[in-house]
């Protein structure tokens, strides 16, 4: 029977700069029941606080709701593991909410084959930003990436769309069924997961010629 091993805070993520969650990996338990607590203070502050919500983020997590989240502060946090034989502390982690944003995937992905009479046909892709992100405030710039591939192909073709929420693709294989997905990331932060795939059948008469 031993004191617990050193825990590690390995990830903090925010969907929208308004809330965030951090997760830790427990160290060894020393063969005894072990309690974990996360404490934090903010930059320029010596007042120590405890995790406000150990439930929302699941096991070994701390969730900071809206009223606990400040974009303008760096959070300095550590996890304490305690059993009957003693305690151990994680390293301190410095968290700036601005840099841990991982949005939800974009929504309402729509894909359509357009075949104008006077121009080359193209694939038209359109989507909406994730609901939790309020782009009107100016706090966010979201960048988008599209990937697509024929259903049976192994390799994805990736297109960077910048801040646009629609995109045209000209070079496609006629007669093929394509999978299309889109994801987004803030200017500082992490890519979202890919949106659920949308399938589109490219007509056989779709021509790539000039």
């Amino acid at each position: 029977q031993l004191p617990p091993g050193k825990p590690e805070i390995f990830k903090c993520r925010s969907p929208n700069k308004e809330t965030f969650t951090c997760w830790w990996r427990p160290g060894t338990d020393g063969g005894l029941p072990t309690n974990y607590s996360l404490t934090y203070h903010r930059e320029g502050e010596t007042l120590m606080h405890e995790c406000p919500d150990y439930i929302t983020g699941g096991p070994n997590s701390c969730h900071f709701g809206k009223q606990y989240t400040s974009m303008w502060r760096t959070y300095i946090m550590m996890v304490n593991a305690t059993n009957q034989m003693g305690s151990s502390f994680s390293d301190e982690l410095y968290v700036d909410v601005t840099y841990i944003v991982q949005p939800d995937p974009p929504l309402e992905l729509a894909v359509e084959v357009k075949q104008p009479e006077d121009r080359k046909p193209y694939l038209w892709i359109k989507w909406s930003p994730p609901t939790l992100i309020d782009l009107k405030t100016g706090w966010f710039t979201l960048l988008y990436e599209i990937r697509l591939k024929p259903e049976k192909a192994a390799e994805w073709e990736i297109h960077f769309a910048g801040q646009q929420t629609e995109f045209k693709i000209l070079s496609l294989h006629p007669g093929q069924k394509y999978l299309v997905q889109v994801r987004c990331k803030p200017d500082h932060g992490y890519w979202s997961a890919w949106s659920p795939a949308t399938f589109i059948q490219i007509p056989s008469d779709f021509t790539m010629n000039d």
């Epitope: 607590s37 930059e43 320029g44 502050e45 120590m48 606080h49 303008w72 502060r73």
Partner: antibody, heavy 118, light 107 residues
Framework: EVQLVESGGDLVQPGESLRLSCTAS????????MNWVRQAPGKGLEWVSY????????YYVDSVKGRFTISRDNAKKSLYLQMNSLRADDTALYYC???????????WGQGTMVTVSS | DIQMTQSPSSLSASVGDRVTITCRAS??????LAWFQQKPGKVPELLIS???TLQSGVPSRFSGSGSGTYFTLTISSLQPEDIATYYC?????????FGGGTKVEIK
């Protein structure tokens, strides 16, 4: 409605003890850090004590250290201040106040009056 | 401990006047500063947090500014209902010190 209601104030003699209570309603009490703040008659506000959400961390103003003890019972949604060795300069209206998530007193009770006099 | 010094301790101004109250910290407190209003016989109410963030429901004639050691609360156009004592308070470390208060009266 978010509310804090203090009780337990009284007239006591110097050296005596008193226990103040504050009952919370309308919010998740166990998620919030709580404080006692006092105001002597005709004077300004003075922070007295702080307790973290689980009760594991406590802070006191120097003038009450060793005499006052802050505690909480999250199951009862209650905050307490055990006041021992009371002195005349402890005479004040005692407020309990909630600390919001960014460390500001956002909700205050109406206060309970403590008078220490012989 | 960090001391908070408010000035003036009292002031008298006319309705419509611009009123400024200052608060000085004896050490850098970043912008961990709040302003409270306490009307006679009432409980203190939070006006401003983080030196300049106006609380919901507080009239826009109130504003806060400053960072570090020097902070101000401004009432752009004093109204009769603004008769109160105003307190600054730092909240970056214990003790969570209040300033001495500024009593605002109408001439």
């Amino acid at each position: 409605e978010v509310q804090l209601v203090e009780s337990g104030g009284d007239l006591v003699q110097p050296g005596e003890s008193l226990r103040l209570s504050c009952t919370a309603s309308g919010f998740t009490f166990n998620s919030y850090e709580m404080n006692w703040v006092r105001q002597a008659p005709g004077k300004g506000l003075e922070w007295v004590s702080y307790i973290s959400s689980s009760g594991g961390t406590k802070y006191y103003v120097d003038s009450v250290k060793g005499r006052f003890t802050i505690s909480r019972d999250n199951a009862k949604k209650s905050l307490y201040l055990q006041m021992n060795s009371l002195r005349a300069d402890d005479t004040a209206l005692y407020y309990c106040a909630r600390l919001n998530g960014v460390d500001v007193f956002d909700i205050w009770g109406q206060g309970t009056m403590v008078t220490v006099s012989s | 401990d960090i001391q908070m010094t408010q000035s003036p301790s009292s002031l008298s101004a006319s309705v419509g006047d611009r009123v400024t109250i200052t608060c000085r910290a004896s050490q850098d407190i970043f912008n961990y500063l709040a302003w409270f209003q306490q009307k006679p016989g009432k409980v203190p109410e939070l006006l401003i947090s983080a030196a300049s963030t106006l609380q919901s429901g507080v009239p826009s004639r109130f504003s806060g500014s400053g960072s570090g050691t020097y902070f101000t609360l401004t009432i752009s156009s004093l109204q009769p209902e603004d008769i109160a004592t105003y307190y600054c308070q730092r909240y970056n470390s214990a003790p969570l010190t209040f300033g001495g208060g500024t009593k605002v009266e109408i001439k």
